[in-house]
């Protein structure tokens, strides 16, 4: 004979557990129904009556099958440096992620708690490592034969144009200027070794120390002016 299907609430067999989407109520000592996502337990079960569920109120949610007495509050509205990538509904929390040009300096379980602007490399410096959703840009000095004339969080150092006749030689922050004969971008004759970064340590402010274990949030604090990170701008 097929086993009889038990309807909630029911007393479980000794040593057995309640079924999927059921929970064991310690007070009633019965297996009772959980509430579906978007709902919460309005009235807990008894020996004779099952759980009574109710919909979550506005700005609250439950994401899982549950028996919580109150729905969880959705997170606060996204800040100006964030975009809402998932709205608050009865079944899911709001998720805020950093808007373009920013990265997540302090993450939370879903989305981002604190966004920070991506570092911008100033002229003479290029992006050694691009910023990602969770990491900042790394700036390094342009090597001889390369240049960057922009203040940018995306631009790398690019090769100087190779001139038949050079009007103005290029440097770390300026491309070479050729005379009217057409320039090329091919390799310079005899240029067989690697480009070397210009050692410009003495020409720039010392880098602002940044802890390696946690993101810097000094731009949020009411502090006096400090020098920008080397090769970067604070804006």
């Amino acid at each position: 004979l097929p086993a009889q299907v038990a309807f909630t609430p029911y007393a479980p067999e000794p040593g057995s557990t309640c079924r999927l989407r059921e929970y064991y109520d310690q007070t009633a000592q019965m297996c009772c129904s959980k509430c579906s996502p978007g709902q919460h337990a309005k009235v807990f079960c008894t020996k004779t009556s099952d759980t009574v569920c109710d919909s979550c109120e506005d700005s609250t949610y439950t994401q899982l099958w549950n028996w919580v007495p109150e729905c969880l509050s959705c997170g606060s509205r996204c800040s100006s440096d964030q975009v809402e990538t998932q709205a608050c509904t009865r079944e899911q929390n709001r998720i805020c992620t950093c808007r373009p040009g920013w990265y997540c300096a302090l993450s939370k379980q879903e989305g981002c708690r604190l966004c920070a602007p991506l570092r911008k490399c100033r002229p003479g410096f290029g992006v050694a490592r691009p910023g990602t959703e969770t990491s900042d840009v790394v700036c390094k000095p342009c090597a001889p034969g390369t240049f960057s004339n922009t203040t940018s969080s995306t631009d790398i150092c690019r090769p100087h144009q190779i001139c038949n006749v050079v009007a103005i030689p290029g440097n770390a922050s300026m491309d070479a200027v050729c005379t009217s004969t057409s320039p090329t971008r091919s390799m310079a004759p005899g240029a067989v070794h690697l480009p070397q970064p210009v050692s410009t340590r003495s020409q720039h402010t010392q880098p602002t120390p940044e802890p390696s274990t946690a993101p810097s949030t000094s731009f949020l604090l009411p502090m006096g002016p400090s020098p920008p990170a080397e090769g970067s701008t604070g804006d």
Epitope: C121, F125, G126, V127, A128, R129, P130, T132, E133, T134, S135, V138, C139, K140, P141, C142, A143, T146, S148, I156, C157, R158, L194, P195, Q196, P197, S199, R201, P207, P209, E210, S212, E230
Partner: antibody, heavy 118, light 107 residues
Framework: EVQLVQSGAEVKKPGATVKISCKVS????????LHWVQQAPGKGLEWMGW????????KYGQKFQSRVTITADTSTDTAYMELSSLRSEDTAVYYC???????????WGQGTLVTVSS | DIVMTQSPATLSVSPGERATLSCKAS??????VDWYQQKPGQSPRVLIY???IRYTGIPARFSGSGSGTEFTLTISILQSEDFAVYFC?????????FGQGTKLEIK
């Protein structure tokens, strides 16, 4: 011309720790990010992590994160990669690579063979 | 993780001919792709960075193209010294990942 010279081959027992050095010469180590890349025998390249010697900030690949430590000594222009809890599958050539403002790994060390065997 | 898939695994071409190597990313990586050459017993060396910029000292016969998810390395007139393994690499997001390599061999 920038040059990266790595320490010599190592033979280690399972469970041991290896520390490889990478000496940067020709230019200051702080002008670069230093990456470490693993290449197992007959296999492809696998990124392990990098260090920015300027501020000692590091970034690790998740596969290696719990076992690798990358450090740099700016006074000697040397970067180090330490890999702990070695197992046989860690037998590989390990490369350091310098990353300049072109955004690429433009100079590589000669590689260090690490053999893990009981 | 972003998966970089190179094809073919092995390419047999005669010297003087053109070789075209493909690299596909599992998601959009913009132009954040580099190409490296590795010869037996040697370290890799960069050929192309940012998908299409030829590195200092690299001969003009090497060119790179593509953006988004599809990238190509072309060697216009193969020289004997070009027979090697070629890897593509993406640096759009962490972890940085490499393709499995294409072995370019003499036909």
């Amino acid at each position: 011309e920038v040059q990266l010279v790595q320490s010599g081959a190592e033979v280690k027992k399972p469970g041991a720790t290896v520390k490889i050095s990478c000496k940067v010469s020709g230019y200051s180590i702080t002008d670069y990010l230093l990456h470490w890349v693993q290449q197992a025998p007959g296999k492809g390249l696998e990124w392990m992590g990098w260090i920015d010697p300027e501020d000692a900030k590091t970034k690790y690949g998740q596969k290696f994160q719990s076992r690798v430590t990358i450090t740099a000594d700016t006074s000697t222009d040397t970067a180090y990669m330490e890999l702990s809890s070695l197992r046989s599958e860690d037998t590989a050539v390990y490369y350091c690579a310098a990353n300049s403002a072109t955004g690429t790994m433009d100079a590589w060390g000669q590689g260090t063979l690490v053999t893990v065997s009981s | 993780d972003i998966v970089m898939t190179q094809s073919p695994a092995t390419l047999s071409v005669s010297p003087g001919e053109r070789a075209t190597l493909s690299c596909k990313a599992s998601q959009n990586v913009g132009s954040n792709v580099d190409w490296y050459q590795q010869k037996p017993g040697q370290s890799p060396r960069v050929l192309i960075y940012k998908a299409s910029i030829r590195y200092t000292g690299i001969p003009a016969r090497f060119s790179g193209s593509g953006s988004g998810t599809e990238f190509t390395l072309t060697i216009s007139i193969l020289q004997s010294e070009d027979f090697a393994v070629y890897f593509c690499m993406q640096s759009k997001s962490y972890p940085i990942t490499f393709g499995q390599g294409t072995k370019l061999e003499i036909k």
